[in-house]
């Protein structure tokens, strides 16, 4: 089953996905799509990177992190209820049936009038750790634990604060991460 993430209408949603490049600058193509990960590609592609850059994106979908270091987490700007659903992050590792795929479920809730709660600083709790297991064909994703009610205000605020900080590695290691090479 998919890992669940939540956001409120009008917020930016954050869907974590990471990989570790085999060597600096040795990037792997990645695609994000709306809908569960099919056998190839990403369903309806909303954003794509190649070996060098983000080479395709649609409005409201962007990468806030340093994708050159493998942070390919997706930010969806100003979400509406229509943004609810499953999203696919696919790491397109070259070779025979090497792709890694992650299904992430985004639940959009109506905006609350109450003030945002205290920010969460327990990064490993805020981002469920993912384990990938190899089998025949693309790897399946299992979760070792998740907090379905985590407030995405906390996550998007933290993501902004941590963009250039040394704590980014903590964040990276607690998301959907694969290592290449």
């Amino acid at each position: 089953s998919e890992v669940e993430y939540r956001a409120e209408v009008g917020q930016n949603a954050y869907l974590p996905c990471f990989y570790t490049p085999a060597a600096p600058g040795n990037l792997v193509p990645v695609c994000w799509g709306k809908g569960a990960c099919p056998v190839f590609e990403c369903g309806n592609v909303v954003l794509r990177t190649d070996e060098r850059d983000v080479n395709y994106w649609t409005s409201r979908y962007w990468l806030n992190g340093d994708f050159r270091k493998g942070d390919v987490s997706l930010t969806i700007e100003n979400v509406t209820l229509a943004d609810s659903g499953i999203y696919c992050c696919r790491i397109q590792i070259p070779g025979i049936m090497n792709d890694e795929k992650f299904n992430l479920k985004l639940v959009i809730k109506p905006a609350k009038v109450t003030p945002a709660p205290t920010r969460q600083r327990d990064f490993t709790a805020a981002f469920p750790r993912m384990l990938t297991t190899r089998g025949h064909g693309p790897a399946e994703t299992q979760t070792l634990g998740s907090l379905p009610d985590i407030n995405l205000t906390q996550i998007s605020t933290l993501a902004n604060e941590l963009r250039d900080s040394r704590l980014a590695n903590d964040l990276r290691d607690s998301g959907a991460t694969i290592r290449i090479g």
Epitope: G35, P38, N44, V45, I96, G137, P138
Partner: antibody, heavy 122, light 107 residues
Framework: EVQLVESGGGLVQPGGSLRLSCAAS????????MAWVRQAPGKGLEWVAN????????YYLDSLKSRFTISRDNAKNSLYLQMNSLRAEDTAVYYC???????????????WGQGTLVTVSS | DIQMTQSPSSLSASVGDRVTITCRAS??????LAWYQQKPGKAPKLLIY???TLAEGVPSRFSGSGSGTDFTLTISSLQPEDFATYYC?????????FGQGTKLEIK
Amino acid sequence: EVQLVESGGGLVQPGGSLRLSCAASGFTFSDYYMAWVRQAPGKGLEWVANINYDGSSTYYLDSLKSRFTISRDNAKNSLYLQMNSLRAEDTAVYYCARDVGYYGGNYGFAYWGQGTLVTVSS
Amino acid sequence: DIQMTQSPSSLSASVGDRVTITCRASDNIYSYLAWYQQKPGKAPKLLIYNAKTLAEGVPSRFSGSGSGTDFTLTISSLQPEDFATYYCQQHYGSPLTFGQGTKLEIK
């Protein structure tokens, strides 16, 4: 008009090799995944292999991946299937098919070639 | 592997009939399902992709529905040229798999 034309089929002895080709025209070849699908005489359809846009990723039916190799040459708008150690059960019509495009969305083999018959027999 | 099971295996019907063919996947394939029509000696032709989207040039009497594990192909009013074999195929898991086919014959 989209066209896929297979060639290279024929009669081959068990243990032999054959290389199938598929010439594509009428679309931007490098924007699509491509596939080979086969059909044994009087039987149903069986997927064989797929290849991504630039040939860097390939996907196979597990039982065939040690003997078959899919490849492409985007400069020549061509798809290939190298078949080694052929067996009687590989006898089939082999179809080249266009699969999903660069932006996803349409999951189905939208265009097919006319097929080329491979017969493995002594 | 995801198994695709079509029913019925064969079907006799008359011109003008409404015909339904079903396809069941052994696992959730969301909407990654295609339907093909094949006539003897010819290559298959895509009818429906993503479970319900009509392929280019396909008559509107063909329609697809379903998601998850259960899918249906409906021909609202059979025409003489519709007598053929129909296959479903999933694009969700590797390996890609087809149903065993449904042969539609003239009654």
